[in-house]
Amino acid sequence: EPHSLRYNLTVLSWDGSVQSGFLAEVHLDGQPFLRCDRQKCRAKPQGQWAEDVLGNKTWDRETRDLTGNGKDLRMTLAHIKDQKEGLHSLQEIRVCEIHEDNSTRSSQHFYYDGELFLSQNLETEEWTMPQSSRAQTLAMNVRNFLKEDAMKTKTHYHAMHADCLQELRRYLKSGVVLRRTVPPMVNVTRSEASEGNITVTCRASGFYPWNITLSWRQDGVSLSHDTQQWGDVLPDGNGTYQTWVATRICQGEEQRFTCYMEHSGNHSTHPVPS
């Protein structure tokens, strides 16, 4: 499970006019960590755990950096040409990670009205964009704006990659990141599928970290990959995660099937309710 620092900035426009202020949230290892409200950015520690460990210097530095990034993002939103009337949002999510093998990752993602349209690997500078023509038009528009001054862009992206990792390392060193394990709650449900068949779904929720193995077994043997459907591992808003796996089985054979869960070295099996 890598250590991660995630910045989420949002700016708004109304009838083509970019609004002042912005919203910023920072997550450390998936936990809410800092927040700036819309009008006046003052980085606030999310919870006593953050405030206790880090001093005022941290909040001053984060406030300064987030304010600068918010200004940049407002300028970017102003350059999006196809803004229709009404309310629109531009969101920038920046993530950096340090993995167990000490390898690092840094990426940046832009969303317009909640739709991803442009990503960049900040370490390698590779840009990627979804295939839809709307996303590609937006992406080229924003990218060209960001590339207008190549030297500025170069400094900007490398600074973001380095700064994010530097902050993450600083937080790790300070001891603010306390590794913890929260075991999942596992719940198995069944529903009618078609005549003679039922769909059984195994849900795991409230777990941390996010790595989990969830699969269906028949007579103790794992079912093949293509006979099972998996949900994404998603944050549930409480700093923990949730996911599910489902398969279709013959009615009357429920007792042969179990859901197998493995998380942080612990494992358990869960039968289908009759």
Partner: antibody, heavy 115, light 108 residues
Framework: QVQLQESGPGLVKPSETLSLTCTVS?????????WNWIRQPPGKGLEWMGF???????KYNPSLKSRITISRDTSENQFSLKLSSVTAADTAVYYC????????WGQGTTVTVSS | EIVLTQSPATLSLSPGERATLSCSAT???????FHWYQQKPGQAPRLLIY???NLASGIPARFSGSGSGTDYTLTISSLEPEDFAVYYC?????????FGQGTKLEIK
């Protein structure tokens, strides 16, 4: 049609500097992508050496970092590799390639390090 | 650095058979930065599959790719004589970019 072509001496003496150039046609090296050098010793696998990106940023393989320099000449649409203090272990086919998933490659040039 | 390990090192199959090549990483890789190449003797490698599952230009549909995290697979559904070559996986998630050591697909 994007094309890449490596050029440079095929024989380099030990302790000297290996110099290669990749000439790109059909695409501007300042528009996008990373412009890479990759090598393959005889009978062995591929090793990424480094790149110069569209913005001019360079990234190198740490295993070569003290010896490698990649530069570009935007007016000629070329990028170059210099590898100093070469030994017999640097004998390889040297390729230039475009991108991050390397979609276009040069045909490769064989460089032998020998006295 | 992220080390990629390909298996098997050599795969001996006959034309018409299905080939499955694996690539395992020491650290998680984003699927959009994972690629496969084919190399024939005396030639430069050529991009086969990019971003885990997308066929590169001119590559026949018998080639397919899948995977996520640390485990990736290249599948050739029915081998043609021209498919016998060396196959390399590559990650572009983090610097240095790295390749697997290669899988040699040979005629049985």
């Amino acid at each position: 049609q994007v094309q890449l072509q490596e050029s440079g001496p095929g024989l380099v003496k030990p302790s000297e500097t290996l110099s290669l150039t990749c000439t790109v046609s059909g695409y501007s090296i300042t528009s996008d992508y990373a412009w890479n050098w990759i090598r393959q010793p005889p009978g062995k696998g591929l090793e990424w050496m480094g790149f110069v990106s569209y913005s001019g940023t360079t990234k190198y393989n740490p295993s070569l970092k003290s010896r490698i320099t990649i530069s570009r000449d935007t007016s000629e649409n070329q990028f170059s590799l210099k590898l100093s203090s070469v030994t017999a272990a640097d004998t390889a086919v040297y390729y230039c390639a475009r991108g991050y998933g390397f979609d276009y490659w040069g045909q490769g040039t064989t460089v032998t390090v020998s006295s | 650095e992220i080390v990629l390990t390909q298996s098997p090192a050599t795969l001996s199959l006959s034309p018409g058979e299905r080939a499955t090549l694996s690539c395992s990483a020491t650290s998680s890789i984003s699927s959009i930065y994972f690629h496969w190449y084919q190399q024939k003797p005396g030639q430069a490698p050529r991009l086969l599959i990019y971003r885990t599952s997308n066929l590169a230009s001119g590559i026949p549909a018998r080639f397919s790719g899948s995977g996520s995290g640390t485990d990736y697979t290249l599948t050739i559904s029915s081998l043609e004589p021209e498919d016998f070559a060396v196959y390399y996986c590559q990650q572009g998630t983090t610097i240095p970019f790295t390749f697997g050591q290669g899988t040699k697909l040979e005629i049985k």
